[in-house]
Each structure stands twice: as structure tokens, then as C-alpha cells.
């Protein structure tokens, strides 16, 4: 159980106050963190709260500004990076959000030698992406879906790719799809450790039928937007991986790296690119239907001017039971022999655990193992590997970070920090400083969260670089919910969940249960995470107590509970909320007749065939920006646990899957349905589809549109969404406003 | 030494289905791709089938795809070709062939084995 | 598919000559060639490998060169036991089909 510390005595309760959806919406309460930019073992940049640009050297303890707040303004500049070799700065501004993390900006370089801006052979603009070499100064720059090369910022530009076009030929960075489904990158362009080369992915979407929707803005007639989105089933992307020489980029031009066979028969994917020496890259493919894998090592070959990937150094990755990996396949952290590489995929016994690939995936050397799951690889050194995972205590929403001594035989464990703040910190994450020489831990909970440094040898906290001071005493007058993480054994099933009470909770009286899910493949909701948000206010204010369940088809908890739901989305994560509802209710101190649902994105598609279960259990709901058919949603996303939506392999499933066919049964509830109009990943198109079932069900509901916004529902729109929702869960559960 | 033994032919009539086998010693069967690759007389060669040694994967030429099934079973050395639905046009020496284990080319050939299909 | 043409199909040398062979690629195989020699009764033996690589117990009047879509197979001076027919075949990438040329024969003049 986590029990926030509880301030509240008698004589002081006078002075503490309930939170306000006002707190929520100002982000009041936000909290923190400190993530340092490491460009050394031992130093890092920061950026200061008065906006400079910091150096600090732990060794010497010393820092200086290295570019003032006064040259950021200049250019209005929101972003920066420094070169490897310290000469320059490329300044961002003009930020422009594109999707989830693509945008465009105007780059400026600034001269650190002489203090001035480059001038000549300015960088066009906007930009898509740019980066710097990982050595020197050579930039990569992506303009108009085309890369370019700059062996110094005031050269010339070289073009490497002359067929971009918008929507069509995409170099350098990803597609849509590829952006939110695969990569979860705004680029799609690697250099190679020393910067020699550059490898490049350029995507073909002349074929991907295109999905359209109006913007409205503020002129006589909307524009159309249209994106090349292939749905479920539909024709998707074609990649091609490109690898140029830096030096000579002339010489020989771009070098395509081949597929392999088992991969290339058939429709597939390309799932991510590592380098492990200047002449050595790691390519990893995956099949259209997702459940093999293949990581294909390629050399090199200087005699041949090419990269030749010989079959012994392609490994296969199959899934029997689900789909490969978990949400993504795994990436591979190589060792310094740089052909053997540590890996995380699932045990004989369906944990996902780290192994170690020496030659060939079956004869892999399990390095974890247990009925927990190891989650990131974060560092590998000569001696050492630094991994998180959710072993401690047994409790699959904390994440802690554990060192195994890899110099050694046999090899110990030790969790770096599993004792440091027990009771504040029980989720972190570490970023690692070059040869993991120091590190920084940021722990985000179920306390306040604190971000810390550390050596790297001896793992002993250096200092603390953020421990949210402010938020702290911000909080001390404030009723803050109690939270506590449980579990409840179903069936053979394990389902975990967190409870956010009222702070003067009395299990003796009866209390309204809102029920806050997403149920995603491969997602957790409960979470050893600090928190103050919305749902916190409606415990603390409005007295509800919410609850997040996390059911079939989750993360972290083995195959068994993750691969549940394969082809069979919409199934048992609906039914697991329903079991653990009924198992909430027999608690006693739930009114079973005030019962609410809501989630967003897929947390919205399940929460809609929750309400339209026809169990009676749910008085009200909300679906923010939901999925209503399968066949609506992202190829990549989708086919990975549903198959494809045809006849002779998974359509029916697609079909009675939909919220559509359930329109009947949302005649005993109310249903709030909420969408933005300029919603690109999960499009409007879905909640058009279930207002119109519901029409002509003559079933009444309640909706709300977002006109011109995307799935993010950001800015105003935020807080007229969680005002609107209140009023509407306040109505649904009869509390005053 | 590697040696590859290829047997299983013989004469059949067009319709019908034979299965050859290929036994494979002097080498660790199950780390090597392996391929049949036919000759029909006085004719060149016609790779027909490919089997990968790790993850199995199977591959075929157009002309036997839907008729002719490669396999292995490395507990006993040995590959297979099961030929079905067998055409005049199959007649050929079939030769049991190891890859290299870096590219698909062939080190080393068995004797071979002749498949007559005719009425 | 990748199409092999080999030339000429037949060669007519005697012992002791330069015998050149020819094999073109329809499309670009990289280095991704092979050269096999076959004798009447007897099953392909492999020379070449990677267009320019010699194979174990291949003697070195045997050179491969080429690249791309050009390759040529090469006996520097012909001895009897040379005289036979000889096929070129791409594995470009590893990819099935795996094709061969139609092959070439070198006969004693």
C-alpha cells in the first residue's frame, strides 16, 4: 500500500484546503525534473531558470555559462545544442509543432570562438530536423523531406537526396505511421559513432491512401489537411535504408542496405537502426504481420564500397504466443567485442528478461530471470550493465535500477536503488554520462519527485539536483488524496490497481467510483508515480473515489497477461474492469448506484464498450478521442494485435469489435462523447461513426467537438474539456455544484 | 569430410507425388541453409527450393510454388523435397546442395538423383 | 527475377589458352556472383564466390572479376581437366529466387 503522508491533524485541518480544479488546470502542482545534457564522462549543460546556458564539471565543481540568456533572446531561441567539439551552438526557434514528435524551426549557429552568429551559407528554413555529428562539427539537416550535409556550418550545403516531396518521398525523417507507431522519433537519419557515415531511411507513401479532414481556422473556406495514414489493412509504407560516407560524400553517393531475406518475401517493416562501430550497423526488420523479427548486423566492406550482411549475423526474433517484443521490439545494447550485443525478450517462461547474444539467438545466455520483467538497459560498460526493472517487493508498477557486475564470474546483482528513499521514491529512471562515469536518477514517485547524482563506480549521491522544493511546501496546506496499490486475484489473474480516497475517507460510508482507464496492449496505468491532476481533485474536493485497473493485456507482468488480448482487442481488458468493479463494490464502501467509466484514446474505446456491456454496473461515462472500429485506426498500431482485417484471417473479429455494433446498449446510460476535429492519429472519423449509430439507434447522449484540435485536446481546450467533465460526472453522481 | 546423399528418385507418372531425400554428414546440419537445385537434360541448372537452418523459413521458384514442400529434420541429418502434382517439365537431376553460411551461394553438391515424370 | 546471360555458350580453346567468360546481370547483384564448373556425369563444383574470391582447392589460374552487372570468370592457361561447362550465379542480398546463367562450355579446340 502507498500511502501518501498524511498532514492532516485536528487542530490543523482548519488551515488545509481541498484542491481546486483551478489548481489542476494552472498546473498548480506540477512538478520537476532535472535531466542532465552530458557531453563528457564528468560535465553536462543545463539550461539555468533564468534561461543560460550552463557547463558543470563534477570533477572540479566548477561551471560557466557557455551562452548567455542574452544571445538565446536574440533569436528567441527555445532550444539549443552545442557541437561535439565545442565550437559551435544551433539555436532552435520558431518552433512548430507538427505531430506527436515531429516539428519544424529556423536554426540559427552561433560561433562560440568569436561570439557571433555564422553568417553565409545560412541554413534554409524551416527545418525538419537537424543534428550535429557525434564527433567534430559536420551537420545533418533535413529541408523539404530532402537531407543535406554541412561539413562546417558555414559551408555549402551537400544534397544527398533529391527526391523528396511532401507527403510522398520522405528522407531523413518518418512518415506519419512510422513517426507515431514504429520509430517514436521526428528523425529517421543515424550517424555513425565517429562520424563517418550517415545512415538515412527514406520512405515511400506513394501508394498510402490518404485520410483528409477540415481545419477550420479563421478564413471564408477550411482547408483540407491530408496525411498518408494506411489503416488497418490498407497498402502501407515502403522503406529503403540508405547509408552515405561523410567524408566522400560524393564519391560513391548513398549505399542501399539490403533487407533480409525473410523479411523482404513479404510486406514489412523496418523497425530501428544502431550503430556499434564506424564500419558496423545494426538494422532490425520486422514482418507486416508482427510476429518475427530479424536483427541483421552489416559490415563494411571497403573493397566493395558497399554493406554486405552476411546471414550468420542475422537474428531471428519470433513470438508464438503474441506479437514480437512488447510495445516495440527491444533494441539490442552491444558489448565492446561489438559483435555480441544484450537484449530483452521473453523467457521460456514468458517473462521479458535481458539475454546475452554471443552467436546465435538459441544458444542466448539469460542474464535476468523471475517472475518480474526487466524493462530498460540503460548502460553497458566493460564491467558493468545498468538495467531497471520491476522485481522489488514484488510490485510491477515500481521501477528501480539495478547494476550487474558483468567483469566478473559469476556475475552479482545489486539494486542501486531500491533502499535510497523507500518510502519517497519507488519509480525512477538514470541518465547515464559517457563510460557511465556518473549518472543522475530521476525518481518520479509515489513522493514528491527528486532527481539526484551519482558516481558511477560507487553509486554514492553527489548531490541533489532537484527535489521540488516549492511543490513541497505548495502542498503542505493542501488535502491531498490518499493512494494505495493493490491487488486483486481473478481466475488466475492478477489484477493490480490503485485507489485514490478521499482524504477524510471512512470505510463505513458509501463514496461514488469513477473507474479512469486506457487497458491498452503493452500499457500500465498503475504506477508507483507522483501525481496531482484531475483525478486527484475529484477525490480530494468532490469526495469520488477513482480507481485504475490494470487488466489483460497490460505490460510487465509476463506473456501470459500481455498476449491475452491478441486478436481479441476489446474483449478481455473491458471485461477485467467489469470484474474489478463487481470486486470494488464488495468492498462496501462504494455506491453502487453513482459508477462512472472514462478514458481517452483507447482508454475511450474501452470505456464506451464498458458502458455498453449491458451490465448495468456503470451509471455514466466519458470517451475522450476514442477508437470506434479497428478498422479506423493505424495499420502499424492495429495489425500488431489484431492481424489483418481480412476474411481469411481476422476480420470477423474486426467487425465485433467495433463500439458501432453495441449502439443498442448505451440506452441505459449516460454517455459523454468527446473528439477534436483535427485529430490525426485517432481521426474524428471514429466518434462521427458512433454519434451516427447512436442516431440511428435513437439512443440520446451527450457530445462535445473540439473544433481544430488534435488528440492532445491542448491549451483552452483542456480546460474546457475537464470543466465540462466535471459538471458532467457531478450531474451523473447528483454533488452540488 | 561433407558429404550430401541425395536418393528417392525414380519414374513417375504426371499427377503423381514423390518425395527425395537428402542425408548430410561432416557438418552441423542444422546451422547451414540448404537448396535443391534441378538440371533437366541437356539443360543448365534451376535452383528449385531453399530451406534456412535457423527460423526455417522456406523458399520457392515460380514454376514448383504450390506443388513442392522443402523440409528438414536436423535430429536425423536430413532434408527433404516433397514433389506433388509432379509435370513432365520436372524431369531432372535434383541435386541436394549446402549454402554458405554467410550467402546463399553453394559450397558443396550431392551426386544427385533423377526424377523421370512421364505417361 | 535477376536474368544471367552467359557468353559465349560455347568456347572452343585448347590447352594452354586464356579462356574468358562472360556473365551479365539484368540488374545490379553487387558482388554477390558465383562460378561453378560442371563435368558430364558429375554434379557442379564451386570456383568462385563474392565475383572474386577463390574457393578451397581451387587452383589460381582461376580468377573472378566484376561487379555490378559485368562479371567474367577467367582461366589464365587451360589445362585438360578444365574443359567443361561452367554457370554463373547470383545471390544478390541472399534473396530467393537464387538464379543461374545458362552456362557456357569450353571444349578442346
Known amino acids: 500500500i502507498v500511502l501518501r503522508p498524511s498532514r492532516v491533524h485536528n487542530s490543523e485541518e482548519n488551515t488545509m484546503r481541498a484542491l481546486t480544479l483551478k489548481d489542476i488546470l494552472n498546473g498548480t502542482f506540477s512538478y520537476k525534473t532535472f535531466f542532465p545534457n552530458w557531453i563528457s564522462g564528468q560535465e553536462y549543460l543545463h539550461q539555468s531558470a533564468d534561461n543560460n546556458i550552463v557547463l558543470y564539471n563534477i570533477e572540479t565543481g566548477q561551471s560557466y555559462t557557455i551562452l548567455s540568456n542574452r544571445t538565446m533572446k536574440s533569436v528567441n531561441a527555445s532550444n539549443y545544442g552545442l557541437s561535439p567539439d565545442r565550437q559551435f551552438v544551433y539555436l532552435e526557434s520558431d518552433y512548430s509543432k507538427l505531430w506527436r514528435y515531429s516539428y519544424t524551426a529556423t536554426y540559427y549557429i552561433y560561433d562560440l570562438s568569436n561570439g557571433e552568429f555564422v553568417r553565409g551559407n545560412e541554413l534554409p528554413r524551416p527545418i525538419q530536423y537537424l543534428c550535429w555529428s557525434p564527433v567534430g562539427s559536420k551537420l545533418a539537416y533535413v529541408y523539404q523531406n530532402n537531407i543535406y550535409l554541412k561539413q562546417r556550418p558555414g559551408d555549402p550545403p551537400f544534397q544527398i537526396t533529391f527526391n523528396g516531396r511532401e507527403n510522398k518521398i520522405f528522407n531523413g525523417i518518418p512518415d506519419w505511421v512510422y513517426e507515431e507507431e514504429m520509430l517514436a522519433t521526428k528523425y529517421a537519419l543515424w550517424w555513425s559513432p565517429n562520424g563517418k557515415f550517415l545512415a538515412y531511411a527514406e520512405f515511400n507513401d506513394t501508394d498510402i491512401p490518404v485520410i483528409a479532414y477540415s481545419y477550420y481556422g479563421d478564413e471564408q473556406y477550411p482547408r483540407t489537411i491530408n496525411i498518408p495514414y494506411p489503416k488497418a489493412g490498407a497498402k502501407n509504407p515502403v522503406v529503403r535504408i540508405f547509408i552515405i560516407d561523410t567524408t566522400y560524400p560524393a564519391y560513391v553517393g548513398p549505399q542501399e542496405v539490403p533487407v533480409p531475406a525473410m523479411i523482404a518475401s513479404s510486406d514489412y517493416y523496418f523497425s530501428w537502426l544502431t550503430w556499434v562501430t564506424d564500419e558496423r550497423v545494426c538494422l532490425q526488420w520486422l514482418k507486416r504481420v508482427q510476429n518475427v523479427s530479424v536483427l541483421s548486423i552489416c559490415d563494411f566492406r571497403e573493397d566493395w564500397q558497399t554493406w554486405d550482411c552476411p546471414k550468420t549475423q542475422e537474428h531471428i526474433e519470433e513470438s508464438r504466443t503474441g506479437w514480437a517484443g512488447g510495445f516495440f521490439v527491444s533494441t539490442p545494447v552491444f558489448s565492446y567485442d561489438a559483435i555480441s550485443y544484450y537484449k530483452i525478450f521473453s523467457d521460456k517462461d514468458g517473462y521479458k528478461h535481458i539475454h546475452y547474444i554471443k552467436d546465435t539467438v538459441e544458444n542466448a545466455i539469460q542474464i535476468t530471470s523471475g517472475k518480474w520483467e526487466a524493462i530498460n538497459i540503460f548502460r553497458v560498460t566493460q564491467d558493468s550493465l545498468f538495467y531497471s526493472s520491476n522485481e522489488f517487493e514484488e510490485y510491477p508498477g515500481r521501477r528501480n535500477i539495478y547494476r550487474i557486475s558483468i567483469g566478473s564470474y559469476p556475475p552479482s546483482k545489486k539494486c542501486v536503488t531500491c533502499h535510497l528513499r523507500k518510502e519517497r521514491c519507488q519509480y525512477y529512471t538514470a541518465s547515464f554520462s559517457d563510460y557511465a562515469k556518473y549518472y543522475a536518477l530521476v525518481c518520479y514517485g509515489p513522493g514528491i519527485p527528486i532527481s539526484t547524482l551519482h558516481d558511477g563506480r560507487t553509486d554514492q549521491e553527489i548531490k541533489i539536483l532537484e527535489e521540488n522544493k516549492e511543490l513541497e511546501n505548495a502542498l503542505k496546506n493542501i488535502q491531498l488524496p490518499k493512494e494505495e496499490i493493490k491487488k486483486l486475484e481473478v481466475d488466475e489473474i492478477t489484477l493490480w490497481y490503485k485507489m485514490i480516497l478521499p482524504p477524510q475517507f471512512d470505510r463505513s460510508k458509501k463514496y461514488p467510483l469513477l473507474i479512469q482507464v486506457y487497458g491498452g496492449p503493452c500499457s500500465q496505468s498503475v504506477r508507483s508515480v507522483f501525481a496531482v491532476n484531475w483525478i486527484s481533485y475529484l477525490a480530494s474536493k468532490e469526495g469520488m473515489v477513482i480507481a485504475l485497473v490494470d487488466g489483460r493485456g497490460t505490460a510487465f507482468q509476463g506473456d501470459k497477461l500481455l498476449y491475452a488480448v491478441y486478436r481479441k482487442l476489446g474483449v478481455y481488458e473491458v471485461e477485467d474492469q467489469i470484474t474489478a468493479v463487481r470486486k470494488f463494490i464488495e468492498m462496501g464502501f462504494i455506491d453502487e448506484k453513482r459508477i462512472a467509466i472514462w478514458g481517452w484514446s483507447y482508454g475511450g474505446y474501452v470505456s464506451s464498450l464498458a458502458l455498453a456491456s449491458g451490465t448495468g454496473l456503470f451509471k455514466c461515462g466519458i470517451a475522450v478521442a476514442p477508437v470506434s472500429s479497428w478498422e479506423y485506426y493505424a495499420s502499424v498500431y492495429t495489425e500488431r494485435f489484431m492481424g489483418l482485417p481480412t476474411k481469411d484471417d481476422n476480420l470477423e473479429h474486426y467487425k465485433n469489435s467495433t463500439v458501432m455494433a453495441r449502439a443498442e446498449y448505451f440506452r441505459n446510460v449516460d454517455y459523454l462523447l468527446i473528439h477534436g476535429t483535427a485529430d490525426d492519429n485517432v481521426h474524428f472519423q471514429n466518434s462521427a461513426q458512433i454519434a451516427k449509430a447512436l442516431v440511428n439507434a435513437q439512443v440520446d447522449f451527450q457530445a462535445m467537438w473540439y473544433s481544430d484540435q488534435n488528440h492532445g485536446l491542448s491549451g483552452l481546450s483542456t480546460n474546457h474539456l475537464y470543466t465540462h467533465m466535471t459538471h458532467f460526472l457531478k450531474q451523473c453522481f447528483s454533488l452540488s455544484d | 569430410d561433407v558429404q550430401l546423399v541425395e536418393s528417392g528418385g525414380g519414374v513417375v507418372r504426371p499427377g503423381e507425388s514423390l518425395t527425395l531425400s537428402c542425408a548430410a554428414s561432416g557438418f552441423t546440419f542444422s546451422n547451414y541453409d540448404m537448396g535443391w537445385v534441378r538440371q533437366a537434360p541437356g539443360e543448365g541448372l534451376e535452383w528449385v527450393s531453399g530451406i534456412r537452418g535457423r527460423g526455417g523459413s522456406t523458399y520457392y521458384a515460380d514454376s514448383v510454388k504450390g506443388r513442392f514442400t522443402i523440409s528438414r529434420d536436423s535430429s536425423k541429418n536430413t532434408l527433404y523435397l516433397q514433389m506433388n502434382s509432379l509435370r513432365a517439365e520436372d524431369t531432372a537431376v535434383y541435386y541436394c546442395a549446402k549454402e554458405n553460411n554467410r550467402h546463399s551461394f553453394f559450397e558443396y553438391w550431392g551426386l544427385g538423383t533423377l526424377v523421370t515424370v512421364s505417361s | 527475377e535477376i536474368v544471367l546471360t552467359q557468353s559465349p555458350g560455347t568456347l572452343s580453346l585448347s590447352p594452354g589458352e586464356r579462356a574468358t567468360l562472360s556473365c551479365r546481370a539484368s540488374?545490379?547483384?553487387?558482388?554477390?556472383l558465383a562460378w561453378y564448373q560442371q563435368k558430364p556425369g558429375q554434379a557442379p563444383r564451386l570456383l568462385i564466390y563474392d565475383a572474386s574470391n577463390r574457393a578451397i582447392d581451387i587452383p589460381d589460374r582461376f580468377s573472378g572479376s566484376g561487379s555490378g552487372t559485368e562479371f567474367t570468370l577467367t582461366i589464365s592457361r587451360l589445362e585438360p581437366e578444365d574443359f567443361a561447362v561452367y554457370y554463373c550465379q547470383q545471390y544478390y542480398n541472399n534473396w530467393p529466387p537464387l538464379t543461374f546463367g545458362g552456362g557456357t562450355k569450353v571444349e578442346i579446340k
Open positions: 540488374q545490379s547483384v553487387g558482388h554477390y
